[in-house]
Interface confidence: low
């Protein structure tokens, strides 16, 4: 489908005469008839197979014709066709004189023809105008013509239909040859497929509009190239969705069990050596001069009571020094110059001679020690209490004061948080790593099931025979309002059939 356009530019009839040579009165009021037909080697009479068009009176004798396409006029003249343009044509242009206003052929005198031209040839579809001028003895006509495709038709013969669109069925404009040219961001045969965000993973991502990247289930990230691990996975990763592969030092289904407390928390202080001893459990081996569960306490070298026989210890920069009591000498006052005759044993200790009286040894009663029974026994020096428990001397024995969550003689046992039945109103207790959780029975809520919530006693539809049920919020019980003809706490008995009471 297309249009043959003819642009009349100038007609010259200087003498104002008809083809017969007779002058027009008062001048030749000129209009044109145009015939477009198939190619003929010799243009001959016959039907105008491609169409005809007539103009109004355009001027008298000689005149120029204005291009009036923008103003809605009829120059260029339009000869539309609804077939494939064959590339060849024949064109006949007649100039006629109109004595009156009626331009119909039958209303014109037989000699009203001013001039007639006929051309034929090849014409390709295109935007460029072909300029032509035809001259006879009395007249001259200057005109130009071209063939263009109708809207939405393309190609060398205007035979290719293409309508630009930007909707669900395609996003494209048409190229001069009628092929589709996708709008930016679209691809595919009909430009229906959006081009996703650059780098969007081919399998794990998709898009419904250009430059978008929507992730399929199990994937995340701007480009949908990161898998989503199992819900609740704490210290783990995935290579496919819903996995939870634990990082080093972590274990359990959700990788939330710390198998390497030493590395993750570095609890041991002052250069102590840390040893993992189970989940969230560790032991610190202290360097000399330090003590405490985490070796956080600095020991004075005198704290170990190195001086024997009542010697007093003095801290020094490079160690310590023992000041020995009379009768003793040596680095730790370990050598005696005394004998049993000097009664060297304190606190009821009994003296035994050694080496023919050159030396002695004290046998101490319970609770005392030292070479002269001068020291009260401290049963806490070996740090017997585990898990940060505090050691207390209690006369001849010792005891451990445990940190919350631990029990046992040496605080070696974990206490279950649920052991003290913290859940009220029959709630079920669940031990968690960092505390506990209560599952409350119906009618109760709160962290410890301590909050009473009202129960809709009517929820179970306890009333019969279409009775109306009301909930007593103060007692969480129900009351049935019976319809006429029924009685009973649940309206279960018809009137006239009283229940059989046991009394």
């Amino acid at each position: 489908s297309g249009v043959f356009q003819l642009q009349l530019q100038e007609f010259i009839n200087e003498r104002g005469v008809l083809a017969s040579g007779r002058p027009c009165e008062p001048g030749c009021r000129t209009f044109f008839r145009v015939c477009l037909k198939h190619f003929q080697a010799v243009v001959s009479p016959g039907p105008c197979t491609f169409g005809t068009v007539s103009t109004p009176v355009l001027g008298t004798n000689s005149f120029a014709v204005r291009d009036d396409s923008s103003g809605g006029g009829r120059n260029p003249l339009q000869l539309p066709f609804n077939f494939t343009w064959p590339g060849t044509f024949s064109l006949i242009i007649e100039a006629w004189h109109a004595p009156g206003d009626d331009l119909r052929p039958e209303a014109l005198p037989p000699d009203a023809l001013i001039s007639k031209i006929a051309i034929q040839g090849s014409l390709a579809v295109g935007q460029n105008w072909l300029l032509d001028e035809q001259t006879s003895t009395l007249t001259r006509l200057r005109y130009s013509y071209r063939v263009i495709c109708s809207d939405n038709y393309y190609g060398d013969n205007c035979s290719r239909l293409c309508k630009k669109r930007n909707d669900h069925f395609g996003h494209y404009v048409c190229q001069p040859d009628g092929n589709l040219s996708c709008l930016p961001g679209w691809t595919g045969e009909y430009c229906q497929q959006p081009i996703c965000l650059s780098g969007c993973h081919e399998q794990n991502g998709y898009c419904s509009k250009p430059a978008e990247c929507l992730c399929r289930p199990g994937w995340q990230g701007r480009l949908c190239n990161e898998c989503i691990p199992h819900n609740g996975c704490r210290h783990g990763t995935c290579s496919t969705p819903w996995q939870c592969t634990c990082d080093e030092g972590w274990g359990g289904l959700f990788c939330d069990q710390d198998l390497n407390y030493c590395t993750h928390h570095s609890p041991c202080k002052n250069g102590a050596t840390c040893s993992n001893s189970g989940q969230r459990s560790y032991t610190c081996t202290c360097r000399p001069g330090y003590t405490g569960v985490d070796c956080e306490l600095e020991l004075s070298e005198c704290d170990s009571n190195p001086c024997r026989n009542g010697g007093s210890c003095k801290d020094q920069e490079d160690g310590y020094h023992c000041l020995c009591p009379p009768g003793y000498y040596g680095l730790h006052c370990e050598h005696s110059t005394l004998s049993c005759a000097d009664s060297p044993c304190f606190n009821g200790g009994s003296c035994r001679e050694r080496n023919q009286g050159a030396n002695y040894a004290c046998e101490c009663p319970p609770n005392f020690t030292g070479s002269n029974c001068e020291k009260k026994v401290d049963r806490c020096t070996s740090n017997p209490c585990a898990n940060g428990g505090q050691c207390l001397n209690r006369g001849p024995s010792r005891m451990c004061r445990c940190r919350p969550g631990f029990t046992g003689t040496y605080c070696e046992l974990h206490v279950s948080d649920c052991a003290r039945n913290p859940c009220a109103h029959g709630g079920t207790c669940h031990d968690l790593e960092n505390g506990l959780m209560c599952t409350c029975p119906a009618g109760f809520s709160g962290r410890r099931c301590e909050v009473r919530t009202s129960i809709d006693a009517c929820a179970s539809s306890p009333c019969f025979n279409r009775a109306t049920c009301y909930t007593d919020l103060s007692t969480d019980t129900f009351v049935c309002n019976c319809p006429y003809g029924f009685v009973g706490s649940r309206c279960e008995f018809p009137v006239g059939l009283p229940p059989s009471f046991p009394w």
């Epitope: 001048g27 109004p56 009176v57 355009l58 001027g59 005149f63």
Partner: nanobody
Framework: EVQLVESGGGLVQPGGSLRLSCAAS????????TGWFRQAPGKEREWVSC????????WYADSVKGRFTISRDNAKNTVYLQMNSPKSEDTAVYYC?????????????WGQGTQVTVSS
């Protein structure tokens, strides 16, 4: 007898203004399409502007659009061309023309012309 007489031509500086008049006798201007054409030395006659007889629609050549204005005074049977901001390339003989055919700018009857020279 149809007669068209142009006036108002002369020397004008670039950027100045000039008004050409076309007075008609022998017919009523308001019924017909009337236009202005011009011809510079050694060049073809060029259509400038046109005002239709039916509804007073106006048309202008691209070269003068926005600078020239065509108007008509039916009482005086006169058509005017107001030339604002003329350029040196507007120098030409300006002709008033009458079309008896239709509202298209044809030139059936001509005046004698008036010279316009744009120069500083």
């Amino acid at each position: 007898e149809v007669q068209l007489v142009e006036s108002g031509g002369g020397l004008v500086q670039p950027g100045g203004s000039l008004r050409l008049s076309c007075a008609a006798s022998g017919f009523t201007l308001g019924v017909y399409a009337t236009g202005w054409f011009r011809q510079a030395p050694g060049k073809e006659r060029e259509w400038v502007s046109c005002i239709s007889g039916s509804d007073g629609s106006t048309w202008y050549a691209d070269s003068v659009k926005g600078r020239f204005t065509i108007s008509r005074d039916n009482a005086k049977n006169t058509v005017y061309l107001q030339m604002n901001s003329p350029k040196s390339e507007d120098t030409a003989v300006y002709y008033c023309a009458l079309s008896l055919g239709s509202s298209w700018c044809a030139y059936d009857y001509w005046g004698q012309g008036t010279q316009v020279t744009v120069s500083s």
